[in-house]
């Protein structure tokens, strides 16, 4: 007796791992026999090479190699994601339609979310390793190696939670190098080494004791720069502090600093940076042109110490120590027109009040300069002669203009009608090209 | 279409807890990370938890940490954030986003707003 | 934790001028794979924040080509060649190299 097609067995979700082919079930009943024809994101699929897809007999599909990402549907955005496969089995009285199995390739992405830090723990004492692993499909798994070996995991003493590796009772045979292993089928990614560090236990109450330290941040002076760090160094300054209470000193010394905000304005976040120094030491990396708030912490293992006092300093500006980018000359009517990008903001070395146009000699444009004030990026200059018109631009700060970006030029022919400033797709004129093409 | 809805926003006690949900759909749930960001009235952005695809790795602020818990269930395409302990300075809308690796979060809900207070 | 700054903080712009948004971070972004994971997200008015560009300079699908973000480091802009009146909102940047994220303050761009 004949009867519509039925889906007795559906494809099921499945990882693609190669090397060999993937296999797609599907199994259906009905009367006469129905036929199988399978579907992609609910695109028919060709069978035809070099489609990578294969029927056999029995409506199984063969994936011979993953199929390309070409027609991912609407809101997958992982190159895990292969796509959704149905089979649909039709005869004369009807067709029926599979449930969706999706096919995935394995993938292990290589930035760790967060990587296990050398560290420093005591004797007898608990200590946690971070690791944060790898974004994986499958999710990955983590271990840990400790000196190039897989470490023996003890109950009771080692857990490992959430990627991270909890040391119950510090021994003085955990000393070494501990790494982080993250773990797929689509391969494992190795974490930086960590170096641990096993101290025997000291007299005193570490917390106690450093809440007693007082720090004074005596001052902070801006350091010369160092002609080793070539011509435009971030500027660096010098901090001093004098440390009284107890006998047991701070292990260590950290920085914060942030820029200061306008009277009355929420203050900006603190950053923090380790000090190399226990009385004095140089903090790098600010920028010029800007107030800045200092203060001093003491810290010991994790315990911290009250902050220090704090101290502002204003470092002076600079001149922008880099051109304004993309500088373009353009025709309008009797008039040029020059526009610039602002130098970019690492180089501002400032705050930015305008810019120097100059005009340069030898060209339609006496010698001339003009000053734009503000955050404009454009000039208009009146011409009244075809020629040649080539121009600088540079940004100007508290201390001056900085340096002048390459000579951009435009040559406006008799007519008017044609200007070019960008020959054979090479970018703008430069002085040197504008006068070749002169003598030619 | 991608679709992200939050929903457990409310009014509540300072020291007292609340849990957040936020429903999925229109993607493969179980592949993507997820996070929760929440704004202060008038105030910026503020991230406050991420859990891994297979929910084993999460990772919070320490304004959060300890107070906070990030869950999921893959089987019903939903995430959750239990907040206990709660203080005045987490009043804010809370809002779920789907995370690309761990690279960016490229779809974000409505949001839903928690106001602690007494 | 790593700061984030953006400046300005408040930006009047001219409809169909150019814009210009500077985001810094306290250390370098760049890991030890030489991935740079910052992204710029714009929050129109009474609305969830929007992707606009990731991993730098990437621009996310359905985004105006009219956007564009550059920088590396600690120093990174967000530029929109032309302004529209649909752009006005706070944009914020995003750090996710290293845990915690931490976003920058937002600057606020209207039409002036």
């Known amino acids: 007796q004949d009867s519509p097609p039925q889906i007795l067995v559906h494809p099921q979700d499945q990882l693609f791992q190669g090397p060999g082919p993937a296999r797609m079930s599907c199994q259906a009943s009905g009367q006469p026999p129905p036929t199988i024809r399978w579907l992609l994101n609910g695109q028919p699929l060709s069978m035809v090479p070099p489609d990578p897809h294969h029927l056999l007999p029995d409506g199984t599909l063969l994936l011979l190699q993953p199929p390309a990402r070409g027609h991912a549907h609407d809101g997958q955005a992982l190159s895990t994601d292969l796509g959704v496969y149905t089979c649909e089995a039709s005869n004369r009285l009807g067709t029926a339609v599979s449930r969706g199995a999706r096919l995935s390739v394995a993938v292990l992405r290589e930035d760790f979310q967060i990587q296990p830090r050398d560290m420093v723990a005591v004797v007898g004492e608990q200590f946690t390793l971070e690791c944060g692993p790898p974004w994986g499909h499958p999710e990955p798994t983590v271990s840990w190696w400790k000196d190039g070996k897989p470490l023996a995991l003890q109950p009771g003493r080692h857990t490992v939670s959430g990627g991270s590796l909890l040391m119950a009772r510090a021994e003085k045979s955990d000393e070494g190098t501990y790494m982080c292993v993250a773990t797929n089928s689509a391969g494992h990614r190795e974490s930086r080494a960590a170096r641990v560090s096993i101290q025997e236990p000291q007299d005193y109450t570490e917390p106690v004791e450093l809440l007693a330290v007082r720090i004074q941040l005596e001052n902070v002076t801006l350091l010369n720069p160092d002609p080793a760090e070539g011509p435009k160094p971030r500027p660096a300054v010098w901090l001093s502090w004098k440390v009284s209470g107890p006998a047991a000193p701070a292990q260590s010394y950290t920085a914060l600093f942030r820029t200061q905000t306008a009277p009355g304005g929420q203050g900006a976040p603190w950053a923090e940076e380790l000090l190399a120094g226990w009385q004095s030491a140089e903090l790098g990396g600010l920028h010029w042109g800007q107030d800045y708030e200092f203060k001093v912490r003491p810290s010991s293992g994790r315990a911290r110490g009250p902050d220090s006092n704090v101290l502002l300093l204003r470092l002076p500006e600079k001149v922008p120590s880099a051109p304004p980018q993309e500088v373009t000359l353009k025709p309008g009517n009797g008039t040029v027109f020059v526009s610039w990008v602002p130098p970019p903001a690492e180089n501002h070395n400032g705050i930015i009040r305008g810019y120097q146009v100059w005009s340069l000699g030898n060209t339609s444009l006496p010698p001339a300069n003009w000053t734009v004030v503000g955050e404009q990026t454009q000039l208009e200059i009146a011409t009244h002669m075809p020629g040649s018109y080539c121009v600088q631009v540079a940004a100007v700060t508290g201390a001056g203009a900085g340096e002048p970006s390459r000579p951009v030029c435009l040559l406006l022919e008799q007519a008017m009608e044609r200007a070019t400033q960008e020959p054979s797709e090479h970018g703008p004129w430069t002085l040197e090209q504008l006068r070749a093409t002169l003598k030619r | 279409e991608v679709q992200l809805v939050e929903s457990g926003g409310g009014l509540v006690q300072p020291g007292g807890s609340l849990r957040l949900s936020c429903a999925a759909s229109g993607f493969t749930f179980s592949t993507y990370a997820m996070s929760w960001v929440r704004q202060a009235p008038g105030k910026g952005l503020e991230w406050v938890a991420t859990?891994?695809?297979?929910?084993?790795?999460?990772y919070y602020p320490d304004s959060v940490k300890g107070r906070f818990t990030i869950s999921r269930d893959n089987a019903k395409n939903t995430l959750y954030l239990q907040m206990n302990s709660l203080r005045a300075e987490d009043t804010a809308v809370y809002y779920c986003?789907?995370?690309?690796?761990?690279?960016?979060?490229?779809?974000w809900g409505q949001g839903t707003l928690v106001t602690v207070s007494s | 934790d790593i700061v984030m700054t953006q400046s300005p903080l408040s930006l009047p712009v001219t409809l169909g001028e150019p814009a210009s948004i500077s985001c810094r971070s306290s250390q370098s972004l760049e890991n030890s794979n030489g991935n740079t994971y910052l992204n710029w997200y714009l929050q129109k008015p009474g609305q969830s924040p929007q992707l606009l560009i990731y991993?730098?300079?990437n621009r996310f699908s359905g985004v105006p080509d009219r956007f564009s973000g550059s920088g590396s480091g600690t120093d990174f802009t967000l530029k929109i060649s032309r302004v529209e009146a649909e752009d006005v909102g706070v944009y914020y940047c995003?750090?996710?190299?290293?845990?915690?994220?931490?976003f920058g303050p937002g600057t606020k761009v209207d039409i002036k």
């Open positions: 859990i891994s695809n297979g929910g084993t790795y999460t």
């Open positions: 986003a789907r995370l690309i690796y761990y690279d960016y979060l490229d779809y």
């Open positions: 991993r730098v300079s």
């Open positions: 995003l750090q996710v190299t290293h845990v915690p994220w931490t």
